[in-house]
């Protein structure tokens, strides 16, 4: 058993049929010695008396808010949560496996630039009685500070018969130099509590590996005389690290109709303009990627050919 | 430590071309190592990230773009800063800093070159003959060093009398390649920045 936060405790259980469970001793936070009784949740049934209560925690029915009272007055609470371990593996029931970039990916993180600011998100099908708490650091043995905000519900989607909820959190490394060469990864730890179930999820990454620039901005077209060709130009996104001559991007320019199966024109360039062949009912799209370290491409920025 | 005196090429930069080749060569070599040594811990997640130039060169700091010298976090470990008179940069100072930057890059290349050559000598003794260093990568390191045009004492190649542990050598190769790729990215950014300046 360990303390998650004040008056909230996590009991780690090996989860299998007829498991013996864990013996837990609760102590009432009071100077009083006599006349103390214990109850669980909203029940008025007295579980025991005395300053300490010893319980055998085996299942979710044994978890919950234990309260010690004296003469009708509440003295203190202890909330017990369960953390299940099945076949030596901690349960991951609360969050959905996003399977990208690999199986057992519960947390996904992205950074728009090298400033040390990043966003992580996760998915769940659970809609109520759900709380998250996020901590982060650079390195684990001698951790350096990363500050994370509160996790918020950022999107709701319908997937078949199920509703899916996306939560996200923003974090910022306390003293980040965009030009630094990372040797210690960022660690992100998410505590998830659903009703009386506790789970924790972690992710470890270098900012350089989670970079995904915003799409290029200000796409403009200039038809070329006596030609089917069009000059398309654009600018670096505002959120990208500066100076741009140091943090350079490379671009992919594509002309395509509505369907992915349609024919297309595609060209890669390090410049902020390119010449392509425009077709009726097609769109010109441009996306960006770090020129020197190939992490993710940005989403497309598009304009119609017409 | 006395840094070699630079004569930076005013037409910046065959160095840009060579640094692009360097990044390409080390990325290809790393990809080849990951594929060939698939049963060894050779991915970014599996290896320890070591920097053989740590405390010996200061490339990131010496080559910091002017715009980032206002960022306190970038100046933490700087012995020398671009800033003079509260962020006013005299042109003499500029060329001095550029010389310092390029000489730091040269020292990095020299250290990696020695490590890679020593390692290659060990890998050539491996009866499995599983992996060797790409001669193209070694040649590209050499070309960039020549383009940087510094004179400094040659570092003798380390020779070891004991029987090499090929497993350890291959893991060390992965560690070295990962670190060198990161440094090659920095070098490419620096060359691109200097070229644009």
């Amino acid at each position: 058993i360990w303390e998650l936060k004040k008056d909230v405790y996590v009991v780690e259980l090996d989860w299998y049929p007829d498991a013996p469970g864990e013996m837990v001793v609760l102590t009432c936070d009071t100077p009083e010695e006599d006349g103390i009784t214990w109850t669980l949740d909203q029940s008025s049934e007295v579980l025991g008396s005395g300053k300490t209560l010893t319980i055998q925690v085996k299942e979710f029915g044994d978890a919950g808010q234990y309260t010690c009272h004296k003469g009708g007055e509440v003295l203190s609470h202890s909330l017990l949560l369960l953390h299940k371990k099945e076949d030596g593996i901690w349960s991951t029931d609360i969050l959905k496996d996003q399977k990208e970039p690999k199986n057992k990916t519960f947390l996904r993180c992205e950074a728009k630039n090298y400033s040390g600011r990043f966003t992580c998100w996760w998915l769940t099908t659970i809609s109520t009685d759900l709380t998250f708490s996020v901590k982060s650091s650079r390195g684990s043995s001698d951790p350096q500070g990363v500050t994370c905000g509160a996790a918020t519900l950022s999107a709701e989607r319908v997937r078949g018969d199920n509703k899916e909820y996306e939560y996200s959190v923003e974090c910022q490394e306390d003293s980040a130099c965009p030009a630094a060469e990372e040797s210690l990864p960022i660690e992100v730890m998410v505590d998830a509590v659903h009703k009386l179930k506790y789970e924790n999820y972690t992710s470890s990454f270098f900012i350089r590996d989670i970079i995904k620039p915003d799409p290029p901005k200000n796409l403009q077209l200039k038809p070329l005389k006596n030609s089917r060709q069009v000059e398309v130009s654009w600018e670096y996104p505002d959120t990208w690290s500066t100076p741009h001559s140091y943090f350079s991007l490379t671009f992919c320019v594509q002309v395509q109709g509505k369907s992915k199966r349609e024919k297309k024109d595609r060209v890669f360039t390090d410049k902020t303009s390119a010449t392509v062949i425009c077709r009726k009912n097609a769109s010109i799209s441009v996306r960006a990627q770090d020129r020197y370290y190939s992490s993710s491409w940005s989403e497309w920025a598009s304009v119609p050919c017409s | 430590r006395n840094l070699p005196v630079a004569t930076p090429d005013p037409g910046m930069f065959p160095c840009l071309h060579h640094s692009q080749n360097l990044l390409r060569a080390v990325s290809n070599m790393l990809q080849k190592a990951r594929q060939t040594l698939e049963f060894y811990p050779c991915t970014s997640e599996e290896i320890d990230h070591e920097d053989i130039t740590k405390d010996k060169t200061s490339t990131v700091e010496a080559c910091l773009p002017l715009e980032l010298t206002k960022n306190e976090s970038c100046l933490n470990s700087r012995e020398t800063s671009f800033i003079t008179n509260g962020s006013c940069l005299a042109s003499r100072k500029t060329s001095f800093m550029m010389a310092l930057c390029l000489s730091s890059i040269y020292e990095d290349l020299k250290m990696y070159q020695v490590e890679f050559k020593t390692m290659n000598a060990k890998l050539l003794m491996d009866p499995k003959r599983q992996i060797f260093l790409d001669q193209n990568m070694l040649a590209v390191i050499d070309e960039l060093m020549q383009a940087l045009n510094f004179n400094s004492e040659t570092v003798p190649q380390k020779s070891s009398l004991e029987e090499p542990d090929f497993y350890k050598t291959k893991i060390k190769l992965c560690i070295l390649l990962h670190a060198f790729r990161i440094r090659a990215v920095t070098i490419d950014r620096v060359m691109s920045y200097l070229n644009a300046s």
Partner: antibody
Framework: QVQLVQSGAEVKKPGSSVKVSCKAS????????LHWVRQAPGQGAEWMGW????????EYAPKFQGRVTITADESTSTAYMELSSLRSEDTAVYYC???????????WGQGTLVTVSS | DIVMTQSPLSLPVTPGEPASISCRAS??????LHWYQQKPGQAPRLLIY???QSISGVPSRFSGSGSGTDFTLTISSLQPEDFATYYC?????????FGQGTKVEIK
């Protein structure tokens, strides 16, 4: 199986014209760009131009502008390349090639040898 | 027009040995470069597109690398069927242009 089948070899006199055909099978004809590339004996390849069979749009290499005409007949899934004012240096194997991507070629015809000789 | 220069023009190789062919562009073309294989009396066949992207059905011993002006086609271990002429082609701008070809011959 996508295939491009070209017309047979031709022998032409200098100053005349030649029209080579390229019949496509497999896949929808208008879903691909169609190019013509030539290769003179022992030489590298030269790109001549492309057509979008969907709308008849064409683009020609400056070297051949004014001498080459590329057309397409959607009803027969056939493209044509006509080269006029032939000279001896036009002796080459002419290939049609196609792709959904405009700028490179993933399927090629078998080639048509055009010999220009007096 | 962008000029593509291949080297060497002829490359004698022992079967089973690796081979590398170089292609240089007269100006930077990013990764807009493609490689073809041509055997005598046959049409070219696409091997690699956009400098390093492999084509399904093409053996994994063929790989491409490079960007900007310098590109390489590598055959990790030459098989008897790989003896042919190899061409690079740029697609950075029109007119599309090819290298003059590299003939890989049996040593």
């Amino acid at each position: 199986q996508v295939q491009l089948v070209q017309s047979g070899a031709e022998v032409k006199k200098p100053g005349s014209s030649v029209k080579v055909s390229c019949k496509a099978s497999g896949g929808t004809f208008s879903d691909y760009y169609l190019h013509w590339v030539r290769q003179a004996p022992g030489q590298g390849a030269e790109w001549m131009g492309w057509i979008d069979p969907e709308n008849g749009d064409t683009e020609y290499a400056p070297k051949f502008q004014g001498r080459v005409t590329i057309t397409a007949d959607e009803s027969t899934s056939t493209a044509y390349m006509e080269l006029s004012s032939l000279r001896s240096e036009d002796t080459a194997v002419y290939y049609c090639a196609r792709n959904k991507e405009l700028r490179y070629f993933d399927v090629w015809g078998q080639g048509t040898l055009v010999t220009v000789s007096s | 027009d962008i000029v593509m220069t291949q080297s060497p023009l002829s490359l004698p190789v022992t079967p089973g040995e690796p081979a590398s062919i170089s292609c240089r562009a007269s100006q930077s073309i990013s990764i807009n470069l493609h490689w073809y294989q041509q055997k005598p009396g046959q049409a070219p066949r696409l091997l690699i597109y956009f400098a390093s992207q492999s084509i399904s059905g093409v053996p994994s011993r063929f790989s491409g690398s490079g960007s900007g002006t310098d590109f390489t086609l590598t055959i990790s271990s030459l098989q008897p069927e790989d003896f042919a002429t190899y061409y690079c082609q740029q697609s950075n701008s029109f007119p599309l242009t090819f290298g003059q070809g590299t003939k890989v011959e049996i040593k």
